[in-house]
């Protein structure tokens, strides 16, 4: 029959591509920290700005009580940078001679909390040594990777010493995630 020569021999069904603008995403920025109690075996979690300046949460991604809440299951890119600053940090041997309050390392951990699992999971961890004699120091630690996350998962950023976090600029210390 006429016209049949143009008919495809098989039909392919394509799922409509999801617009990037519809996907959950958030970028949180540093804010002044308030001293809070934290668990004995866990570094304190940072509090974040979710709405002012460069910060935002979109498409059901929510921030509450130091946690970024994952609204749907999928593969997410999760990232954080924490910039630390401090006064001169003496090296280990000097520290051992009676200055135990000076850190010789700084650590950032991105942690996942799942309600159905009792223990928080460390997703990413970064550590740097700070041993700069004779100067004040600044050290950024950047972490970022892709993870398969489930709806209801909660993400937070923990640091070894909240008092050393540089909260003066929103482009120095930040935390975010977006659905790929």
């Amino acid at each position: 029959l006429k016209g049949q020569e143009f008919a495809p021999s098989h039909q392919q069904v394509y799922a409509p591509l999801r617009a990037d603008g519809d996907k959950p995403r958030a970028h949180l920025t540093v804010v002044r920290q308030t001293p809070t109690q934290h668990l004995k075996n866990q570094f304190p979690a940072l509090h974040w700005e979710h709405e002012l300046g460069l910060a935002f949460t979109k498409n059901r991604m929510n921030y509450t009580n130091k946690f970024l809440l994952i609204p749907e299951s999928g593969d997410y890119f999760v990232y954080s940078q924490v910039t630390f600053r401090g006064m001169t940090s003496e090296c280990s041997e000097i520290r051992q001679a009676g200055r135990p309050n000076k850190p010789d390392s700084i650590t950032v951990v991105i942690t996942k909390v799942t309600d159905s699992y009792p223990e928080p999971t460390q997703l990413l961890m970064g550590t740097k040594s700070v041993c700069e004699v004779g100067s004040n120091w600044f050290q950024p630690i950047y972490l970022g990777a892709m993870f398969s996350l489930q709806e209801g998962d909660k993400l937070m950023v923990n640091v070894s010493d909240i008092s050393l976090v540089d909260y003066t600029k929103e482009d120095k210390t930040f935390f975010g995630a977006f659905l790929l």
């Epitope: 804010v31 002044r32 700005e49 979710h50 709405e51 460069l54 009580n65 909260y167 929103e170």
Partner: antibody
Amino acid sequence: QVQLQESGPGLVKPSETLSLTCTVSGGSISSYFWSWIRQPPGKCLEWIGYIYYSGQTKYNPSLKSRVTISIDTSKNQFSLKLSSVTAADTAVYYCARETGSYYGFDYWGQGTLVTVSS
Amino acid sequence: DIQMTQSPSSLSASVGDRVTITCRASQSINNYLNWYQQRPGKAPKLLIYAASSLQSGVPSRFSGSGSGTDFTLTISSLQPEDFATYYCQQSYSTPRTFGCGTKLEIK
């Protein structure tokens, strides 16, 4: 101790532009969010908008078409311009500081009354 | 915009009384709720931030509670200097919005 001080004319004619400046002393204007808030006589407080030290602004949609907030970090000042004013814009205008969403407006200027009248 | 509703709009009480003021948000604001005190002719003063955190320098007789949409400010024992107007304010989203105030008067 951080202090905020509003300055500008107390009387503005209808259809003209209201201009106010807030001078910040005792601390840096950097790393904070700086807002303008107004209170018509005997009425509720109304947030006008904020500016960040980087120059980023966000305005109340109800006033957005008439508002401009700017900042001069070298002078530790930020300013408000409200165009096409009417009698409804008569209010005490406050400048205020916000450290972040979590912390509220922790420092305020003493306020300046601006009357719109011919 | 998030609407903030305060009640009561005015309240008479005596020195030493325990007083509670309530504030309701038109949608959940988690704990992004602040309380201010304003005396006549003065600027508002921050009392409580993040629903329950006492601002530095504020007497401990002031306390706040609540989360989501319903919040309260409590003054445990009224002092003469507490007679003023109190405002709640949400800082969950912009535009920032305030309640219209509760005027606390001497009985």
